[in-house]
């Protein structure tokens, strides 16, 4: 049986059940290389507390549909009066990066995972030439996830003192110059994740090969190498390579750009101080507030919730958007869709789409940006579920009793962007990270 998601095959992926102190290793096409789980384990459960391993999915006993992968085992599970076997079930959803498998829950018999990934999309619009896993777990099983830094088009310009060259990078994947043909990037060779521009010429100085690595508690490293044979004439016979070290800052701060810290014979060392290198619990919340020792800040957007069936309305040319954030009140236009953001076509109000659901909510504060994300909306033709990204700005004089109002700023590939000036986005900082 052919592998259903070949892009995901090259790596063993990790997922974590933090509540039970369990690390899962997943290889969806072959087997994980862990002796204790046996030679054919596709999903290996490592119980860190008891230091034991259990295979909860066998690569030989795989069954697949377009959006579901199941690995059975021959191990019977303890459900009275049945002869069920332990199994793992991975539900795939379309995403804009390779993404990460997320542990959802487990019963006596089944371990459930969900994976939003380009590999599950109906169309290839989000697929990279080359992309590598972009997250790691530290020794405390906390997730460090750089997926939000991945650019789907364009690139980051590295801060470099050399006026004659410009180094552009992407994170964990190659630079897509077709979707955003900026004049400087247009000449970059396909597949490059590090592109050196000199005058009118552009050179591939690195492609992603291995996934993100954790080198110390708050330092993550990505290594790019030039795969192509044939040396560049300005590299003194060396093969180009790029090392990007992502550093979690010691306290809350605004974002910085990547900086070139060393350069020798086409070996480029880049340091990027960014809160995205910190563990995810430091940056994110599933509720509308971020507070406590762990996050170093106090943010509470819950006063923005609307009651009594009313919604915020944002004009989007062809569409009206109805928003009800930080609550579970149904938007009347989007009846029974559990939508936090509802898109209604002006010319045909029967055309209604959920652009993100209130159960699928993430509040993120990173590098000085406060963002509320609603995902899991109605599918677009690509298979991608509509989502909304609301970027908040602190405004102590916002109207509407300080609440302000969301403003639609645009749409890219079924992701809807809004800005929202409000006094409730004014962040209070603590200092003890």
């Amino acid at each position: 049986q052919a592998a259903p998601f070949p892009e995901l095959c090259s790596y063993t992926w990790e997922a974590v059940d933090t509540k039970n102190n369990v690390l899962y290793k997943i290889n969806i096409c072959g087997s994980v290389d862990i002796v204790q789980c046996g030679p054919s384990s596709a999903v290996c459960m490592h119980d860190l507390k008891t230091r034991t391993y259990h295979s909860v999915g066998d690569s030989v006993l795989r069954s697949a549909t377009r959006s579901l992968l199941e690995f059975n085992t021959t191990v019977s599970c303890d459900q009275q009066g049945t002869n069920h076997r332990v199994q793992s079930s991975i539900a795939f959803l379309c995403g804009k990066t390779l993404g990460t498998p997320e542990f959802v829950t487990a019963t006596e018999c089944v371990h459930y995972f969900e994976w939003r990934t380009t590999a599950a999309c109906k169309k290839d619009i989000f697929k990279a030439n080359k992309e590598v896993p972009c997250y790691v777990f530290d020794e405390e099983l906390r997730k460090h996830d750089l997926n939000p830094l991945i650019k789907l088009s364009g690139a980051y310009l590295v801060d470099d003192s050399d006026p004659d060259t410009s180094l552009f990078i992407n994170v964990c994947r190659d630079i897509d110059t077709l979707r955003d043909p900026g004049s400087q990037l247009r000449a970059c060779p396909p597949g490059t994740a590090a592109c050196l521009v000199r005058g009118h010429q552009a050179f591939d100085v690195g492609q992603p090969r291995d996934g993100l690595k954790l080198v110390r508690k708050d330092r993550l490293v990505l290594s790019y190498v030039r795969e192509e044979a044939g040396k560049l004439d300005f590299c003194d016979g060396h093969s180009p390579a790029v090392t990007i070290t992502f550093v979690c800052p010691s306290e809350r701060r605004e974002g910085t750009i990547p900086k070139l810290t060393a350069k020798s014979n086409c070996r480029y060392e880049i340091e990027w101080i960014t809160e995205y290198a910190c563990h995810r619990d430091y940056l994110e919340s599933k509720t509308c507030s971020l507070s406590g020792e762990q996050q170093d800040v106090s943010i509470d957007l819950t006063p923005l919730a609307q009651s009594g069936g009313s919604s915020y309305i944002s004009d989007g040319k062809e569409y009206l958007f109805y928003l009800n954030v930080c609550g579970e009140t149904e938007i009347q236009f989007c009846n029974k869709k559990q939508a936090a953001v509802c898109q209604v076509k002006k010319s045909d109000t029967s055309q209604v789409k959920a652009a993100g659901r209130y159960h699928n909510q993430t509040l993120r504060y990173s590098d000085g940006d406060l963002t509320l994300i609603y995902f899991g909306g109605d599918e677009c033709s690509s298979g991608f579920q509509r989502m909304s990204v609301i970027n908040f700005e602190c405004n102590k004089t916002a109207g509407n009793d300080g609440k302000g109002t969301p403003v639609f700023t645009g749409e890219v590939d079924c992701t809807y962007f809004f800005t929202w000036d409000t006094e409730y986005a004014c962040v209070h900082h603590h200092h003890h990270h």
């Epitope: 509540k19 039970n20 019963t107 006596e108």
Partner: nanobody, 111 residues
Framework: QVQLQESGGGLVQPGGSLRLSCAAS????????MDWYRQAPGKQREWVAT???????TYADSVKDRFTISRDNAKNTVNLYMNSLQPEDTAVYYC?????WGQGTQVTVSS
């Protein structure tokens, strides 16, 4: 304040059965992972069985197919059913949740 209290230990003949219980105050078992450990005289404490918060169960090889761990949410207890007991099962049995431990209950298997 969290307290765990084991009960049900005793003297049993080889091949016999026992049911150990762990009662809790200050913690809700259904939200937490529970483990049973045991310590035989002169030996290190060893893991016996796990009941995760979601319901999956795992057992040490030495007790697999003989011991069963289960939860009674109404009574907020976790039980360890022990069948086909052997002399090598003689030990003090402890229940554990995170950093919290019970005082232990003695199980002796002897004819």
């Amino acid at each position: 304040q969290v307290q765990l209290q084991e009960s049900g230990g005793g003297l049993v003949q080889p091949g016999g059965s026992l049911r150990l219980s762990c009662a809790a105050s200050g913690i809700i078992f259904s939200d937490n992972r529970m483990d049973w450990y045991r310590q035989a005289p002169g030996k290190q404490r060893e893991w016996v069985a796990t009941l995760a918060s979601y319901g999956w169960k795992t057992y040490a090889d030495s007790v697999k197919d003989r011991f069963t761990i289960s939860r009674d949410n109404a009574k907020n207890t976790v039980n360890l059913y022990m069948n086909s007991l052997q002399p090598e099962d003689t030990a003090v049995y402890y229940c554990n949740s995170g950093q919290y431990w019970g005082q232990g209950t003695q199980v002796t298997v002897s004819s």
